[in-house]
């Protein structure tokens, strides 16, 4: 799996999970989230050569097409596969509210 | 939806469905498929600016992050959303076989 266990321990140019810390205020301009101040969102990036963690038959076809037709602009892309939620604390007036934001943290990647 | 109805009628630099005809022999080197000789596979391509058909909360966060930090390499990618199968005819010896290959045709796209 193209997850932290594999990707963070290997130098990998191909599609893999990459570390990314996002500070809500600095990076998104969000002032409404009180806690946490930021989080490890991670992201997916890297090349998708033939059979490198292809998600579907179409992505396998596309990567093979791209191998045979390297000048073509059609190729699979490295995107998130498994995502996890993030629990946040914010305030409405002086009332604290806890909410779980779904699909905020990328745990693994795929070529799609 | 970023499907043929929208994308093939509009000139769109952002993430959209793009037409792509794949000839099995020429483009993939596959000689085993007897019919069809090729098919409209389509593919997804284009920029993923903030809120452009974001798939998940993470892709929304990532596109906003990319807007505020344009020098960053972290950004969402335009990939397939809905896929359809393709029915093919091939031979095992002289025996014709009909099979449905799943997820072969892209019908719509998303930013993920």
């Amino acid at each position: 799996a193209l997850d932290a266990a594999y990707c963070f321990r290997n130098v990998q140019d191909n599609c893999c999970l990459r570390p990314l810390y996002i500070d809500f205020k600095r990076d998104l301009g969000w002032k409404w989230i009180h806690e946490p101040k930021g989080y490890n969102a991670n992201f997916c990036a890297g090349a998708c050569p033939y059979l490198w963690s292809s998600d579907t038959q179409h992505s396998r076809v596309l990567s093979l097409y791209n191998t045979i037709n390297p000048e073509a602009s059609a190729s699979p892309c490295c995107v998130s596969q498994d995502l996890e939620p993030l629990t946040i604390l914010y305030y409405i007036g002086k009332t604290p509210k806890i909410e779980q934001l779904s699909n905020m943290i990328v745990k693994s990647c795929k070529c799609s | 939806a970023l499907d043929a109805a929208y994308c093939f009628r509009n000139v769109q630099d952002n993430c959209c469905l793009r037409p792509l005809y794949i000839d099995f022999k020429r483009d993939l080197g596959w000689k085993w498929i007897h019919e069809p000789k090729g098919y409209n596979a389509n593919f997804c391509a284009g920029a993923c600016p903030y809120l452009w058909s974001s798939d998940t909360q993470h892709s929304r966060v990532l596109s906003l992050y990319n807007t505020i930090n344009p020098e960053a390499s972290a950004s969402p990618c335009c990939v397939s959303q809905d896929l359809e199968p393709l029915t093919i005819l091939y031979y095992i010896g002289k025996t014709p076989k009909i099979e449905q290959l799943s997820n072969m045709i892209v019908k719509s796209c998303k930013c993920s």
Epitope: Y21, D23, K25, R26, K31, H34, E35, P36, K37, G38, Y39, N40, T87, L89, P96 | -
Partner: antibody
Framework: EVQLVQSAAEVKKPGASVKVSCKTS????????MNWVQQAPGAGLDWMGQ????????NYNGKFKGRVTLTADTSTSTAYMELSSLRAEDTAVYYC??????????WGQGTLVTVSS | EIVMTQSPASLSLSQGEKVTITCRAS??????LAWYQQRPGQAPKLLIY???NLADGVPSRFSGSGSGTDFSLTISSLEPEDVAVYYC?????????FGQGTK
Amino acid sequence: EVQLVQSAAEVKKPGASVKVSCKTSGYTFTSSWMNWVQQAPGAGLDWMGQIYPGDGDTNYNGKFKGRVTLTADTSTSTAYMELSSLRAEDTAVYYCARHYDGSTDYWGQGTLVTVSS
Amino acid sequence: EIVMTQSPASLSLSQGEKVTITCRASENIYSNLAWYQQRPGQAPKLLIYAATNLADGVPSRFSGSGSGTDFSLTISSLEPEDVAVYYCQHFWGTPYTFGQGTK
């Protein structure tokens, strides 16, 4: 390299005010919260408050009853902690510490403030 | 405010022994907890952040576990330089209170 360098030790009289500085380098000062922590002699750590230098936003510990004021000078990348109406029990080491990823990852060396008549 | 309760208050151990320090929050703080080491006359040093993540440059003999209200810091094999006071601190709504420390 991230560095937080604090001002020298101070001796103050009860009722006076003290202003401790924390000069930073090696990171974007305006983009990280700065926390302040008090440690009385032989005691544990007490969180006093935090400031976001980018916009001056602050959060304070009510324990210090409005006696603490946090400020930041973005032109010199320096954070300040002012404690007023000093009393003997304010004798302590005061630390500035950068907030990052659900922790305070870099700390100043500490500034001893002695309150004595 | 959230109260952080650390135990034990102090420990006396030998080199090579395993030690576990616990920290309990008065309410759910999810994984928003850090551990620090403070040697005599020095500023605290970050060991663990987000409950389980080892800070840069910290030896692998240190590890953190837990979420919700119960957390622990483990030193798998004590070294002489580990003599210090250890503190936990939550980051789930201000004030960010500390545990009382374990010597």
